[in-house]
Interface confidence: low
């Protein structure tokens, strides 16, 4: 299709080489079409456009995105050629930064229903460059946390080194919707709720003698609870002794609750004490079995193929730790009375003999 009639917008993405960040392009179709095609209307509910030249209001089609090669080749369908660029309704998400994202991006409605619709398109000229090292050290992160229930603020990374007084007028979006209540380089949140979480975009205009560009940055905002002040607690095993049958397989599960930490490095391991020896056991990976706003429950199992006489003399210890401290729970195995027949006991003794030989040839010291 002929793109000469498309409205044009110039954008600049100055990415930080120090951190991962994303970028977003909106399909800014001319009003009133934009409000009709995309779920990011800038009209208030009371402002209804006079006419909708595109399509029936019951259809809310997506838009189609293209990239225009610099050498004049035909337009490329982004979905096919650029796996790191994701199409989502009326937005284009760049998952990884890099100068190779520089180029012209065109969007238009997928469904064209009348001759007037053909010119309904937007061409975005995107320039991508690494941020100069001269920019300030304390620039805001592209991932920002807000503490639930407290006051907080979201800063525009590309302007965070400027004072509010010298900052240009900023346009903010949250999850693709225009936020009209602020034009400064910071959004101040009086009380943080869960719904403050999301993808924020801040835009401001930068002009030189030749042309003007929209400088854009994307911020992922997380709403979090405060870091825990408690060490983890072990929910299971509760008992310090466990009745077992000799010669039978056994799984002992350790479940522990870890309070929320912004930097979360949980430690959970099993080790065995036998007389004056102590060693860590190689067990399956720990897995998260429940996550909530305030804590996470993690489970890790120790698996014995067959319980031996030697296991009855050992202590099995689950050790858990976070940045505050550690907790342990010891389990001693106790033979179930009258459970196994003579064959089971002979079999268990045979296994124990093999294991003793193997243990003496390896004896892994833990401490």
């Amino acid at each position: 299709f002929n793109i000469s009639g498309c409205s044009t917008k110039k954008l600049l993405w100055a990415y930080s080489t120090r951190s991962e960040e994303e970028f977003i392009l909106f399909c800014d179709l001319p009003e009133p079409q934009k409000s009709h095609f995309c779920h990011r209307s800038q009209l208030s509910p009371t402002q209804v456009p006079d006419h909708l030249p595109f399509t029936d209001s019951k259809d809310l089609p997506d838009v189609q995105w293209y990239r225009q090669p610099s050498n004049g080749d035909p337009l490329e369908d982004i979905r096919k050629s650029y796996p790191h660029i994701i199409q989502d309704k009326c937005t284009l998400r760049f998952l990884t930064p890099g100068v190779n994202n520089t180029g012209s991006y065109i969007c238009r409605p997928k469904m064209i229903k009348s001759p007037y619709d053909v010119a309904c398109c937007v061409k975005m000229i995107l320039e991508v460059k690494p941020q100069s090292n001269a920019s300030c050290e304390n620039s805001a992160s592209h991932k920002q946390d807000l503490l639930l229930g407290s006051t907080g603020s979201i800063s525009c990374p590309s302007l965070s080194c400027q004072s509010d007084a010298q900052s240009p007028e900023v346009t903010w979006y949250k999850n693709g919707k225009l936020l009209s209540m602020t034009r400064s380089n910071r959004i101040v949140v009086d009380e943080v709720y869960i719904y403050h979480q999301g993808t924020y975009v801040c835009d401001y205009t930068q002009s030189d003698t030749a042309s003007s560009w929209t400088v854009r940055a994307v911020v992922q905002v997380r709403t979090i609870v405060g870091d825990t002040k408690l060490k983890p607690d072990i929910l299971d095993p509760v008992e310090s002794t466990l009745e077992v049958e000799l010669g039978k397989p056994l799984t002992i599960s350790c479940k522990a609750r870890f309070g929320f930490e912004r930097v979360f490095n949980p430690v959970m391991k099993w080790y065995i004490k036998d007389a004056d020896l102590e060693w860590e056991v190689s067990v399956p990976e720990a897995k998260s079995i429940k996550s909530t706003l305030k804590d996470e429950i993690i489970e890790r199992n120790i698996i014995l193929e067959k319980v031996t006489q030697r296991d009855l003399r050992r202590t099995f210890v689950c050790f858990v730790q976070n940045s505050i401290g550690n907790t342990t729970q010891s389990v001693q195995l106790k033979e179930k009375r009258g459970s196994g027949g003579l064959n089971d006991i002979f079999e268990a003794q045979k296994i124990e003999w093999h294991e003793t030989v193997r243990f003496q040839s390896h004896h892994h010291h833990h401490h």
């Epitope: 709720y193 719904y195 979480q197 929320f260 996550s291 706003l293």
Partner: antibody, heavy 123, light 107 residues
Framework: QVQLQQSGPGLVKPSETLSLTCTVS????????WTWIRQPPGKGLEWIGY???????NYNPSLKSRVTISVDTSKNQFSLKLSSVTAADTAVYYC?????????????????WGQGTTVTVSS | AIQLTQSPSSLSASVGDRVTITCRAS??????LAWYQQRPGKAPKLLIY???NWESGVPSRFSGSGSGTDFTLTISSLQPEDFATYYC?????????FGQGTKVEIK
Amino acid sequence: QVQLQQSGPGLVKPSETLSLTCTVSGGSISNYYWTWIRQPPGKGLEWIGYISDSGSTNYNPSLKSRVTISVDTSKNQFSLKLSSVTAADTAVYYCARETIVVRGFYFYVMDVWGQGTTVTVSS
Amino acid sequence: AIQLTQSPSSLSASVGDRVTITCRASQGISSALAWYQQRPGKAPKLLIYDASNWESGVPSRFSGSGSGTDFTLTISSLQPEDFATYYCQQFNSYPWTFGQGTKVEIK
């Protein structure tokens, strides 16, 4: 423990507006999304829409033109209005709490449900 | 809207049986899937969220797995109280949608 108590008429005439209310007890309406879901007789579940405690809404496009969900934080209540009803709107209507669980980033769970209100559209 | 297709639509099983229900999404939804149990005349009850996490108080015989487009709910040893209808639901993009349900009946 949070509980959701539904109220509203069980019979609505065609072309009229269906109105249901869900009262939250044992907890606050703050910090959550509040959802309506319906289930026609012998059929599956259909999401109608949600409202947050701040009043922001999101509706199923198939019902958007007829649905209004509102919240009254002072009464710990949220409500559903469905206009111009027909026999096809006969269903059990449920209210539910939608929690955002945070660990790294977000996902959603509908963890508390109302008891359900059977609404019949008939003249 | 994302469509979720459950299979089978219904199944007959005995107490103690291992039961597997699958849910297929019409497009990738990462792990944004929940499973619910609904007994006759009752509201749905959340079992699993984020594809594989147990909701508090749900017995460990229920487990969920999968990501992308294919998901599974497994009941390792069916109990009398497990005879019900099970629904999957996606939380990946609006509108939230449900599968058509799988009815687990007594053989």
